[in-house]
């Protein structure tokens, strides 16, 4: 008995698609061995049609594929555009066709039901609208028009021109008779139900002179589109429900074990808390279509999703829906990165953002997720250098360390910086990731003066105190601009007196500007890093003024512990040109700047090695 298992019989109709899932014991050998789908011939040989090694026979070219899911011990064979020639006996298996582990599958593709001559076929998805056209002759123009449904040998009246409406179609059907000269009447049925499926008969007039036309109405359940995405990655559900429901509330829901559908997000402002910080419902187009983006995919996000339209913002029978079956692949190409990063007020965080390493030239972005209404994510910074004004001097996007990861540094943290942020590029949308910044109790590790006024033409010395725990780190000073932070030469001044509980390893590293020029005005960061990996930073604003008193100016170490002065940036509303974003609708049309909050100086970020999912921790 073979341990491979699958459907013994698959039946479908011409033009349809099938998705055949085969199961195997997920041993290490089985997971990585060749998977195949072959057709059994009269000779008993089984001819490969598609395999996991990329082979696709000419008969299947452009209409079939095989996808392996090693973590589940399954593989799926998708075959589209079925014809009756595809009927036959097949095997799905592992290894070599002739002697591997396999399972027999019978595929039967039928023509579909025989219909009376001249029958018009209408194929419509459940919940949508159908317009049945019924021609008639001139002599029947003044006579009664009607639509019947054939049930077995009987015909049941559905609607007629004398205002009769069958109760099963109440409030969702209308019969239209055009003006003179047009010899056709139409019946429009809205919000189609599965039970509407069947053969209908249009009739105009009565007796032997009556006009008749058969209509076959095929109401289809939405076939779930199979969606395979990587753990930690992102999925986008594109939902196009038609103009008929363009102005009706939209929703995405997830089918649960009780056969109901829990709203994940809708346009009425409802959102499942499990998706907090990692979901956006993009604004509708004029045609009523919309999309939902979910980032930071988890294994528990797997399941059947439906999008739909209804005034209540939730699933109702007879309204249009679209369906997806989401599978989350645990053998993910997206690397693990912290989902939570912790910092202290006045401190800093350095966030690592993954991107598809094949797209090193793509533009990188960082945005702040906002939960109001359908969610939006205004851009804060991009790799070309644009930074929202209120983040001036405290936010930078660095291409380092590269090879699939970029870094975002945010300092001068306040409690208002707590929240969810998204890393994204203008390339592969599946690599969008979410990180939550939490502000915890503690003091910044790096100590710098609150603000500094330098005198034109003189020497300025700015100290930065590093605690002993950073003894092995590289220390640096850089000048911030909206295109990055340009490293400057700095000087190690020896042990720092700012950390009394520390030994010789605590350092004072200063930046010297000599002589001070007008161009020196601006933000300066001192920070630590290890190779291309950035740690904590602290920011100082240097103002430059005219010379008043002769002599050089030195900011004493004592002043470094003084409370930093507040610097409030322009908090006005600002448009950000949303350049090069693959799906600009991901972001709201207006980029509204959040409240700037307190712009205190100082810096702190920490890495807690106790969890692969979190960065941070309180001060040591």
């Amino acid at each position: 008995k073979s341990p491979v298992f699958g459907p013994q019989e698959v039946s479908s109709v011409e033009g349809n698609s099938v998705s055949i899932k085969c199961y195997y014991p997920p041993t290490s050998v089985n997971r990585h061995t060749r998977k195949y789908w072959c057709r059994k011939g009269a000779s008993g040989r089984c001819i490969t049609l598609v395999s996991s090694e990329g082979y696709v026979s000419s008969n299947y070219a452009g209409r079939a594929n095989l996808t392996n899911f090693p973590e589940n011990g399954t593989f799926v064979v998708n075959i589209a555009q079925l014809s009756r020639d595809d009927s036959g006996h097949y095997k799905c298996g592992l290894g070599i066709n002739s002697r591997g582990l396999s399972f027999d599958v019978s595929l039967e593709v039928s023509q579909g039901p025989e219909l009376p001559n001249g029958t018009e076929v209408y194929t419509v998805d459940v919940g949508r609208t159908v317009t049945i056209k019924c021609p008639f002759k001139t002599e029947n123009a003044p006579k009664t028009k009607a639509l019947y449904k054939k049930i077995g040998q009987t015909s049941v009246l559905v609607i007629d021109s004398r205002n009769y409406v069958n109760p099963n179609y109440k409030d969702r059907i209308r019969l239209r008779i055009p003006g003179t000269g047009q010899l056709i009447f139409t019946v429009v049925i809205d919000r189609l139900r599965l039970s509407d499926h069947g053969l209908y008969l249009c009739q105009a007039g009565d007796g032997s002179n009556r006009d008749e036309k058969n209509a076959d109405l095929q109401v289809l359940e939405p076939e779930p589109e199979l969606v395979y995405e990587d753990l930690r990655g992102s999925v986008t559900f594109h939902c196009a429900l038609g103009l008929e429901v363009a102005n009706v509330a939209k929703f995405l829901c997830r089918v649960n074990s009780r056969e109901t559908c829990d709203v994940v997000i809708n346009t009425l402002g409802k959102r499942d808390s499990a998706f907090e910080g990692r979901i956006l419902l993009n604004p509708q187009d004029k045609d009523g279509s919309f999309s939902v983006v979910i980032t930071g995919l988890r294994k528990e996000d797997e399941g059947r999703y439906l999008c739909g339209a209804h005034s209540d913002g939730q699933l109702q029978e007879g309204w249009p829906i679209q369906a997806w079956q989401l599978f989350v692949n645990e053998e993910s190409t997206i690397p693990r990165s912290p989902t939570v990063v912790k910092g202290v007020a006045g401190g800093s965080v350095a966030v690592l953002c993954p991107y598809n390493p094949k797209e090193s030239q793509s533009l990188k972005y960082w945005c702040l997720w906002e939960g109001a209404q359908n969610g939006r994510c205004p851009l804060l910074v991009e790799s070309q250098g644009l930074v929202q004004e209120q983040y001036e001097g405290r936010l930078s996007l660095l291409q380092e360390p590269g090879n699939g990861t970029f870094t975002v540094i945010l300092n001068q943290l306040t409690t208002q910086d707590a929240g969810f942020y998204w890393c994204l590029t203008n390339g592969d949308t599946r690599w969008r990731t979410t990180v939550e910044i939490k502000i915890i109790e503690g003091e910044p590790n790096l100590k710098v003066p609150g603000n500094v006024t330098a005198v034109l033409g003189e020497t300025l010395n700015i100290p930065c105190h590093f605690p002993c725990k950073f003894s092995s780190y590289e220390k640096y000073w850089c000048k911030w601009s909206n295109t990055g932070c340009q490293t400057l030469p700095s000087q190690d001044e020896g042990p720092s007196e700012a950390f009394v509980n520390c030994d010789e390893n605590s350092r004072l590293v200063s930046l010297t500007l000599n002589p001070v020029t007008r161009a020196d005005e601006g933000w300066y960061w001192c920070g630590v890093k290890q190779g291309h990996f950035y740690g904590e930073t602290a920011a100082v604003y240097v103002a430059v003024e005219e010379k008043k008193v002769a002599g050089s100016r030195y900011v004493s170490p004592a002043k470094a512990d003084a409370a930093p002065d507040e610097k409030v940036l322009d908090s006005g509303v600002r448009e950000i040109e949303n350049k090069a974003i693959q799906d600009p609708r991901l972001f709201a049309e207006e980029k509204v700047v959040a409240d700037t909050g307190d712009q205190a100086g100082g810096s702190r970020a920490s890495v807690d090695s106790s969890s692969s999912e979190e960065q941070g921790g309180s001060s040591k």
Epitope: S12, V13, N16, E221, E259
Partner: nanobody, 126 residues
């Protein structure tokens, strides 16, 4: 909610046939698959057959011991699933349960079915 009601069980001789029916009512429009499980005296409940569907495509799964003897089918209009059992054997004696699922990652697993009927007794005497 979805309600499942089985019928068609009974006492038959070995080699005879029986047809079980399972009628579903309630919110069946999101149902993705329906199947039959059985529990013999003193045994665990086990998978017998399942039918899943997507539009007009049907997928039928059977356990090895019933292949070629049992046939699962469905009537979409009546929301009913049938199990035609031919060439019955004494070892087929069991309570047969109908089950329905919204999402099936593996049709053989009991815990993937969200709804269960009360069961119908099938007894095959030799």
């Amino acid at each position: 909610q979805v309600q499942l009601v089985e019928s068609g069980g009974g006492l038959v001789q070995a080699g005879d046939s029986l047809r079980l029916s399972c009628a579903a009512s309630g919110r069946t429009f999101t149902t993705y698959g329906m199947g039959w499980f059985r529990q013999g005296p003193g045994k665990e409940r086990e998978f017998v057959a399942t039918i899943t569907w997507s539009g007009s495509t049907n997928y039928k799964y059977y356990t090895d011991s019933v292949k070629g003897r049992f046939t699962i089918s469905r009537d979409n209009a009546k929301n009913t699933v049938y199990l035609q059992m031919n060439s019955l054997k004494p070892e087929d004696t069991a309570v047969y349960y109908c089950a329905a699922s919204t999402v099936l990652t593996d049709p053989r697993r009991l815990n993937e079915y969200d709804y269960w009927g009360q069961g119908t007794q099938v007894t095959v005497s030799s």
